[in-house]
């Protein structure tokens, strides 16, 4: 209708990075920009994704290098993290959120794809990491190895080999395991502290240089107490599980101190593994019973999990695997390991700013049934799995509903702000829920809409529209872009209108009748009034139309509803040659060129396109007859 198709601004970017996957208009004290997501962008050797800021009128885009943002105290994996897959602008302060839903971190032998987002302030400076699903690794451990280095230990090289082999089994790194070693005999010394080395390679290298210090006495109690009171303090981390491994070959010369030392270790929640090396006893034919009892006393209960004995120093190698496995069985304590909570949640797959924070879709949460998390300045709200059972029953738990594929919110005069989330794979047909979240991690689900067709991906895109700008939502639009009709993936957009407290189905938006795949409804944007009739409007993307070139449809709002026939269809081919997937993302909230009219930003594969609004001239014809 009034969008200019002759002089668009086509902003080029990398196709391989999928520059244009997401677009957002941005205003910094009067200067207008486009923020463009490129979720496959490369940073160095890693395909992290990134976000660009692009000047609206002329000039080149600048990468914000958010892909370089690192989280401390985690062993992160940023490759393929898809930064820019979702963008959400906060119009209050012009900050925005850029999410990396496939950001993952190493936990033991696993990579947990919890996802994370970066908050960027109005002048494009990174300000904060938002990662509500990030939990401490079960391998968040401080391990202190207490080595008997007294004269009777022989040969020392076997102890060294054992030490190196056990260290190689440890997941050493930020947010995971730290290792310190103390050696004792008559005295105790730090070989290295917990925070001296940050990788297996470095720790192994340090361990290979530990020499036997000797000593005629074996002060095991003192060694344990030194580890507890000093080694765990120097470089120890708050909240880390404390693990001590004691390796000794004989009764201690200070065993009367053991009771107090062990009590203090218990009080400090130090889990103790104890290894009795019987070489000295066996070489001399001495009964080791008293020694073994002492080592069992040192080991945490139960003994069968924490106590080891070996015939001699050379046999230490035989317990490496068992000891490693026992320590890491601490990982799964009280956990049903066949089930995932937030470990694979992919938080930030979708995002939406609300008054008191941000909603984040987490499609991988709860075994890919999905969830919506909320991050606020006061903390985070993570609804429990059970909160969703009313609409996501237990019997469908293995179906992977992908709740949180998209998130938005509506405002009703009765209930105020209500959150909306789509689960496009629910029971194969898709579902949308409207709910409120509570700080006790429960939800109240007010309404649910279900898709009609298997595989249609109903709920993969949702937009709420306040047509008349009164602050109350009038229309909720739900996309089912894979809706199959007439032999093609045509797509469908369902219209729901607010009546009292419920959204009532009121037909679908009309698309064009081409006989190719279209995926109409892949993106749906509520935009400010384009045609200057004082009603807000809607733009729908069909990125597969015209042989994947793409198209957008403009629908006008009118008196609290939406006109279901498009007022304008803009195809990529009208704008520029070579555009593909035009319409994969849309945003229209700002006047970008200072002409008083709202302009559109549309994403495509490797491009961002700005479409300028033209003024609408209303001609009121009046007919006068003379003589009357």
């Amino acid at each position: 209708f009034n969008m200019d198709t002759r002089k668009p601004r086509v902003i080029p970017g990398s196709r391989t990075a999928f520059f244009g996957y997401t677009v957002q208009q941005h205003d910094i004290s009067g200067n207008k920009w486009l923020v463009v997501g490129a979720p496959l962008e490369t940073n160095g050797y890693q395909k992290t994704g990134d976000v660009y800021k692009c000047p609206v009128i002329h000039g080149n885009c600048t990468k914000l290098n958010l892909g370089r943002v690192t989280l401390s105290n985690v062993s992160e994996r940023k490759d393929n993290m898809r930064l820019g897959l979702s963008l959400a602008t906060n119009p209050k302060d012009n900050s925005f959120l850029a999410c990396s839903p496939l950001w993952s971190h190493e936990c033991g032998s696993s990579y947990y794809t919890t996802g994370m987002c970066s908050r960027v302030n109005s002048n494009f400076r990174f300000s904060k990491t938002v990662a509500p699903a990030l939990q401490r690794c079960q391998t968040y451990m401080d391990i202190v190895i207490v080595l008997d280095g007294s004269n009777s230990i022989y040969p020392w090289v076997e102890v060294q080999h054992f030490l190196i082999n056990i260290l190689k089994k440890f997941y050493i790194g930020p947010g995971q395991i730290q290792v310190g070693v103390v050696q004792y005999g008559e005295d105790v010394v730090h070989e290295f502290h917990l925070n001296d080395y940050r990788s297996v390679k470095d720790v192994v290298e340090a361990a290979s240089h530990i020499e036997q210090r000797g000593g005629t006495e074996t002060r095991t109690a003192f060694g344990i107490e030194f580890a507890r009171s000093e080694a765990f303090q120097k470089g120890g981390r708050k909240g880390a599980k404390k693990v001590m491994i004691v390796i000794t070959d004989g009764e201690s010369h200070d065993s009367p101190d053991l009771e107090k030392v062990i009590q203090q270790s218990e009080r400090d929640n130090v889990t103790r593994y104890a290894v009795a090396v019987l070489g000295y006893y066996n070489r001399r034919g001495i009964n080791p019973e008293t020694f073994l009892n002492e080592i069992k006393y040192i080991a945490s209960d139960p003994d069968d999990k924490h106590f080891f004995n070996v015939t001699d120093e050379a046999a230490l190698k035989d317990i490496v695997d068992a000891l490693g496995d026992r320590i890491f069985s601490l990982e799964g304590t009280n956990k049903n390991e066949t089930s995932f909570g937030l470990e694979m949640s992919q938080t930030g797959f979708s995002s939406h700013v609300v008054e008191d924070g941000v909603l984040l879709g987490a499609v991988g949460a709860y075994d890919w049934n999905g969830a919506v998390l909320k991050e606020t300045s006061a903390g985070k709200v993570i609804p429990l799995r059970e909160s969703y059972l009313k609409e996501f029953p237990e019997e469908l738990k293995n179906h992977g509903a992908y709740l949180g594929y998209t998130v938005t919110s509506v405002v009703s005069s009765r209930q105020g702000r209500v959150y909306v989330a789509g689960a496009p794979r629910f029971n194969h047909t898709g579902k949308v829920i409207l709910f409120t979240m509570h700080n006790n991690r429960s939800l109240t689900i007010h309404q649910a809409m279900r898709g009609q067709q298997i595989g249609s991906y109903f709920g993969s895109e949702i937009t709420s529209v306040d047509i008349d700008g009164d602050g109350v939502t009038d229309v909720l639009l739900v996309g089912a872009p894979m809706y199959f009709n007439e032999g093609r993936e045509r797509g469908k957009v369902y219209v729901y209108e607010l009546r009292q407290n419920l959204f009532v189905y009121n037909g679908t938006l009309k698309d064009s009748h081409s006989y190719q795949n279209a995926r109409f409804g892949s993106s749906i944007a509520s935009v400010r009034d384009l045609n200057q009739d004082s009603y807000n409007d809607v733009v729908v993307g069909a990125p597969l139309e015209d042989n994947h070139a793409g198209a957008i449809y403009i629908f006008h709002g009118f008196r609290g509803s939406i006109l279901k026939t498009p007022k304008q269809r803009i195809t990529a081919s009208e704008l520029a040659t070579g555009l593909q997937y035009f319409g994969c993302s849309i945003h229209g909230q700002l006047d970008l060129n200072e002409d008083g009219l709202i302009d559109l930003a549309v994403g495509a594969l490797g491009n961002a396109v700005i479409l300028w609004s033209r003024p609408v001239v209303q001609i009121n014809a009046s007919l006068h007859f003379e003589p009357s």
Epitope: F222, H253, D254, S255, P256, D257, E259, K260, T290, N293
Partner: antibody
């Protein structure tokens, strides 16, 4: 030659204080434990307190807990028993004895004893 | 706390007699039980440690044994210098709390 010599005993009034010393020679206090054991006139042996000179961990019999304090000065190779709030029933010969790994945690050397009399 | 009940409290024997003194622990204990001999006006002397090991310099007529919670000191052939009071002593494992028996006075018959 291993020797333990107690000193500091004497007559004291009820409620009074006394400090006993146990000077060790022929071995290093640092690598052993010192126990104080007492024997009231005509009675059996009663364990009083112990200290690890190395770690400074202490143990006390219930009858003296809160009143007596055991300590050691490894530089002087001497152990001490500070006795406060003394009562008539604390009247006894006080012995110090060595306790260590090499005697399988038995009291292998004893001092000659020092008499403490609590009387008004 | 572990109690050590020593019996008899006194006994009369003749030179050459076999004498047995018993200590019973109130609960299961380690073998860290020692026996001491004390003569009037003197400090106690260690005879037996670890329930059955003879301390150096102690005549071989002294022996110790254990059966469950019962610990026994045996003098195989009583000598004139053996008339004294004997005490058992138990060490609490992994602490330096110790307990003495009440003592057994061995007198000349």
């Amino acid at each position: 030659e291993v020797q333990l010599v107690e000193s500091g005993g004497g007559l004291v009034q009820p409620g009074g204080s006394l400090r006993l010393s146990c000077a060790a020679s022929g071995f290093n206090l640092y690598s052993s434990y010192i126990h104080w054991v007492r024997q009231a006139p005509g009675k059996g042996l009663e364990w009083v307190a112990s200290i690890s000179s190395y770690s400074s961990y202490t143990y006390y019999a219930d009858s003296v807990k809160g009143r007596f304090t055991i300590s050691a000065d490894t530089s002087k190779n001497t152990a001490y028993l500070q006795m406060n709030s003394l009562r008539a029933e604390d009247t006894a010969v006080y012995y110090c004895a060595r306790y260590w790994y090499y005697s399988a945690w038995a009291l292998d050397y004893w001092g000659q004893g020092t008499l403490v009399t609590v009387s008004s | 706390d572990i109690q050590m009940t020593q019996s008899p409290s006194s006994l009369s024997a003749s030179v050459g007699d076999r004498v047995t003194i018993t200590c019973r622990a109130s609960q299961s204990v380690s073998s860290a039980v020692a026996w001491y001999q004390q003569k009037p006006g003197k400090a106690p002397k260690l005879l037996i440690y670890s329930a059955s090991d003879l301390y150096s310099g102690v005549p071989s007529r002294f022996s110790g044994s254990r059966s469950g919670t019962d610990f026994t000191l045996t003098i195989s052939s009583l000598q004139p210098e053996d008339f004294a009071t004997y005490y058992c002593q138990q060490s609490a494992p992994y602490s330096s709390l110790i307990t003495f028996g009440q003592g057994t006075k061995v007198e000349i018959k």
